[in-house]
């Protein structure tokens, strides 16, 4: 018992002596955060000058405070022990570590391109004022059906697969009427209506696709992640939409 007590005391003395010799060798190690070791004044600890800070002890200089100017605004003021923190003014959002950049907001249903804010292409959406347009979820990949159609601002909502729909549940396509004798004119007119609707849809789709192809060729966009601050666009919407494939990080696309 006495032996172990002796060991503890010896260790404590050793540690205390080490700390003493270390501070004798390097008096700067005693300087706390918010101060710096002033070589010009016999290495005494001097407080950081205004607009500077030191976040750790034993520093020989204080760092200049970050200034939140222009589109940046101060989220946290600089103190003698910590740097200022910035965020972006409304209409802009932060990018990069510690909000090193501010990027212009667009509207939901748009994305920011080199030429400003562009509407999302058909089949893509952006539910935020920042970021890129992303493809609608493909419900069929999960064996589900589309419950709510997608828009430029919102993704599709997937529902149960058509097979899972219980009898009596409302279905998009009406069930085919039962074949009964003496009802052939109704059946014929029903199928005629169905075929003409399908043809109309096909015609509409082809027209739409042709116009998108033409427009896509007319305006090939180079889309990039902006390394600088964009000026605020006074007119956010231009004609045309910004098209990209999901796997593309940069560059435009032709439909």
């Amino acid at each position: 018992m006495g032996n172990s007590c002796y060991n503890i005391v010896a260790t404590l003395l050793l540690v205390l002596n080490f700390e003493r010799t270390r501070s004798l060798q390097d008096p700067c190690s005693n300087c706390p955060a918010g101060t710096f070791c002033d070589n010009n004044r016999n290495q005494i600890c001097s407080p950081c000058p205004p607009n500077s800070f030191s976040s750790a002890g034993g520093q020989r200089t204080c760092d200049i405070c970050r200034q939140c100017k222009g589109v940046f605004r101060t989220r946290k003021e600089c103190s003698s022990t910590s740097n200022a923190e910035c965020d972006c003014t409304p209409g802009f959002h932060c990018l990069g570590a510690g909000c090193s950049m501010c990027e212009q907001d667009c509207k939901q249903g748009q994305e920011l391109t080199k030429k400003g804010c562009k509407d999302c292409c058909f089949g893509t959406f952006n539910d935020q004022k920042r970021g890129i347009c992303r493809p609608w979820t493909n419900c069929s990949l999960d064996g589900k059906s589309v419950l709510v159609n997608g828009t430029k601002e919102r993704d599709v909502v997937c529902g149960p697969s058509p097979a899972d729909l219980s009898p009596g549940a409302s279905s998009v396509t009406p069930p085919a009427p039962a074949r009964e004798p003496g009802h052939s004119p109704q059946i014929i007119s029903f199928f005629l209506a169905l075929t003409s609707t399908a043809l109309l849809f096909l015609l509409f789709f082809l027209t739409l696709r042709f116009s998108v192809v033409k427009r896509g060729r007319k305006k090939l966009l180079y889309i990039f992640k902006q390394p600088f601050m964009r000026p605020v666009q006074t007119t956010q919407e231009e004609d045309g939409c910004s098209c990209r494939f999901p796997e593309e990080e940069e560059g435009g696309c032709e439909l």
Partner: antibody, heavy 117, light 107 residues
Framework: EVQLVESGGGLVQPGGSLRLSCAAS????????IHWVRQAPGKGLEWVSG????????YYADSVKGRFTISRDNSKNTLYLQLNSLRAEDTAVYYC??????????WGQGTLVTVSS | DIQLTQSPSSLSASVGDRVTITCRAS??????LAWYQQKPGKAPKLLIY???NLETGVPSRFSGSGSGTDFTLTISSLQPEDFATYYC?????????FGQGTKVEIK
């Protein structure tokens, strides 16, 4: 379907630590900031912390700054909140919430953290 | 930090009533304000974003208005499922502050 599921809550002594997790599914995780919001029993909502989609910018309420650390693992679609130096006033249900344009459009069901000796 | 003050703290109303809840900010938050509904034991649900935009799937009886410092949430005709606590939240500053809440109870 967007889902957020919190876990890791429990009883802890004052001064103790805890790590909360929030597993996300049904959306592109990296495209959204995620936040922690807490609610003390019988009280209102209090924003705690937030992190950007890339994980490179973090935000904290003054009441937790220096004690709590928010992080995310985008490869696992998981958000974390490390709670250190816990106090009795940290007792609350902790919700993770997806940020869409600075508002919170989807919330988890919450996990209860009780700080008591 | 920006403070949000809701009024009233609680109110009693009947089904079919028109209900108005106000939220006042200690400084201008532009239109960066959202409204949430919370029922006991459940997570909050987003109702209104950007002060006046109705969130997808939220009934049209809910509406929001205002900008700057004064905001209003209106329920045009109160339904049984609307009895809950309502919170406003500002996102003008990155410290997303919430109002203290307004409890809507059955009269």
């Amino acid at each position: 379907e967007v889902q957020l599921v919190e876990s890791g809550g429990g009883l802890v002594q004052p001064g103790g630590s805890l790590r909360l997790s929030c597993a996300a599914s049904g959306f592109t995780f990296t495209s959204y900031g995620i936040h922690w919001v807490r609610q003390a029993p019988g009280k209102g909502l209090e924003w705690v912390s937030g992190i950007s989609g890339a994980g490179d910018t973090t935000y904290y309420a003054d009441s937790v700054k220096g004690r709590f650390t928010i992080s995310r693992d985008n490869s696992k679609n998981t958000l974390y909140l490390q709670l250190n130096s816990l106090r009795a006033e940290d007792t609350a249900v902790y919700y993770c919430a997806r940020e869409r344009d600075y508002d919170f459009d989807y919330w988890g069901q919450g996990t209860l953290v009780t700080v008591s000796s | 930090d920006i403070q949000l003050t809701q009024s009233p703290s609680s109110l009693s109303a009947s089904v079919g009533d028109r209900v108005t809840i106000t939220c006042r900010a200690s400084q201008s938050v532009s239109s960066y304000l959202a409204w949430y509904q919370q029922k006991p034991g459940k997570a909050p649900k987003l109702l209104i974003y950007d002060a006046s935009n109705l969130e997808t799937g939220v009934p049209s009886r809910f509406s929001g208005s205002g900008s700057g410092t004064d905001f209003t949430l209106t329920i045009s005709s109160l339904q049984p499922e609307d009895f809950a606590t309502y919170y406003c939240q500002q996102s003008y500053s990155t410290s997303h502050t919430f109002g203290q809440g307004t409890k809507v109870e059955i009269k």
